[in-house]
């Protein structure tokens, strides 16, 4: 049994890091493998992660972490029984994938303005709470070409757009994702999408 693709890990910079790897053949990850991880810090205990299958030869492990600070570094040992298959390390702050925003809501009752709001996925005491920026994706269910991205570079989790920038009388969907420049993170997954019917009063044409 050998590792074909070495583990790569990403952290949500809160409580979970996810590591994925591939074996050289079909593997029952949960019965055959264990991923041991330990913070390089005095008196930190080693923890064991039981991996799950992720495709035939792929494995994924969700490492639980009490908290994360930027200096943290973990040793990782992948074991098959008594055999050490791979040894490495992982610094969560250098491989951050933020949590996806939640509670995306479209408020359509504000005088021909669409107000989109969502929730920051981090608690106020987490470093990323004040460092997230967002991308909002809006698309038409009727017209695949009607697809747009709004970059929200301020901290407030909201976006205002004129309803008239979208077509009237048709349904739209929106979703939002996050990233943090300070840690050069990857983008989060998209939030679940929300749907609304766009309608607004056309201005009277003057002849």
């Amino acid at each position: 049994m050998k590792v074909l693709q070495e583990p790569t890990c990403v952290s949500d910079y809160m409580s979970i890091s996810t590591c994925e790897w591939k074996m050289n053949g079909p593997t029952n990850c949960s019965t055959e493998l264990r991923l041991l991880y330990q913070l390089v810090f005095l008196l930190s205990e080693a923890h064991t992660c039981i991996p799950e299958n992720n495709g035939g030869a792929g494995c994924v492990c969700h490492l639980l972490m009490d908290d994360v600070v930027s200096a943290d570094n973990y040793t990782l040992d992948l074991w098959a029984g008594q055999q050490l298959l791979w040894k490495g390390s992982f610094k969560p702050s250098e491989h951050v994938k933020p949590r996806a925003p939640g509670n995306l809501t479209v408020h359509t009752n504000v005088s021909d303005t669409l107000l989109l709001t969502w929730s920051n996925p981090y608690p106020p005491d987490n470093y990323l709470y004040n460092h997230l920026t967002y991308a909002v994706n809006i698309w038409s269910e009727n017209d695949p070409a009607d697809f747009r991205i709004y970059n929200v570079t301020y901290l407030e989790p909201s976006l205002r757009i004129a309803a008239s920038t979208l077509k009237s009388g048709i349904s739209y969907r929106a979703r939002v994702r996050a990233w943090a420049q300070c840690y050069n993170t990857t983008w989060s997954e998209w939030s679940p999408s929300t749907k609304w019917h766009n309608s607004y009063r056309e201005p009277f044409e003057q002849h």
């Epitope: 390089v40 810090f41 005095l42 008196l43 930190s44 205990e45 009490d66 908290d67 600070v69 930027s70 200096a71 570094n73």
Partner: antibody, heavy 117, light 108 residues
Framework: QLQLVESGGGLVQPGGSLRLSCAAS????????MSWVRQAPGKGLEWVSG????????AYADSVKGRFTISRDNAKNTLYLQMNSLKPDDTAVYYC??????????WGQGTQVTVSS | QTVVTQEPSLSVSPGGTVTLTCGLS?????????PGWYQQTPGQAPRSLIY???SRHSGVPSRYSGSISGNKATLTITGAEPEDEADYYC????????FGGGTKLTVL
């Protein structure tokens, strides 16, 4: 409200023993690395010993190795320090500390240990 | 034997800014040393100010800030107040936890 209350200090003769206790409340004791830190009269702070959150790993300053034993009872939210073969140099205020350096740290008010004949 | 170095004493005028440093007798302080800062006033137990280089303990005023500058950890007090007069200790993760000798800060 978070609290750490040390007890068990006192006056002891050189070569004698004492057992310090630290009762914790107001936080999840079992999640914290715990330490004992001491301060001799008119001197600075010295880390003495520490124990992992689950109690499986311990560490000691060279000055107390082989004489002091740290332990914890997570069911009772209590930290202990068994001190044997005490020397006059061990005279100090002993503080119980939750979470040094890496997370928010909380200190007890301390208990006085005096080693004198 | 790891020795953590601090200025024995410093003074600052009320409203002024002062920077305390925390170094190693050999080598540089990095974030992997998780520098922490502790304040102690006479007759009181120490209290935590800064942990993991720059994170402020809850309840600590924003005039206290921690960082690493050059090869040392630093604690900066901006807009010093009379109640900031105290002993300040740094500690580093270096095999074990090692405290510095402390800095006596006078506000005058």
């Amino acid at each position: 409200q978070l609290q750490l209350v040390e007890s068990g200090g006192g006056l002891v003769q050189p070569g004698g023993s004492l057992r310090l206790s630290c009762a914790a409340s107001g936080f999840t004791f079992s999640s914290y690395i715990m330490s004992w830190v001491r301060q001799a009269p008119g001197k600075g702070l010295e880390w003495v010993s520490g124990i992992s959150s689950g109690g499986g790993i311990t560490a000691y300053a060279d000055s107390v190795k082989g004489r002091f034993t740290i332990s914890r009872d997570n069911a009772k939210n209590t930290l202990y320090l068994q001190m044997n073969s005490l020397k006059p140099d061990d005279t100090a205020v002993y503080y119980c500390v939750a979470g040094l350096l890496r997370v928010e740290g909380y200190w007890g008010q301390g208990t006085q240990v005096t080693v004198s004949s | 034997q790891t020795v953590v170095t601090q200025e024995p004493s410093l003074s600052v005028s009320p409203g002024g800014t002062v920077t305390l440093t925390c170094g190693l007798s050999s080598g540089s302080v990095t974030s992997s040393n998780y520098p922490g800062w502790y304040q102690q006033t006479p007759g009181q137990a120490p209290r935590s100010l800064i942990y993991a280089t720059a994170s402020r303990h809850s309840g600590v005023p924003s005039r206290y800030s921690g960082s690493i500058s050059g090869n040392k950890a630093t604690l900066t007090i901006t807009g010093a107040e009379p109640e900031d007069e105290a002993d300040y200790y740094c500690a580093l993760h270096k095999g074990t936890y090692v405290f510095g000798g402390g800095t006596k800060l006078t506000v005058l």
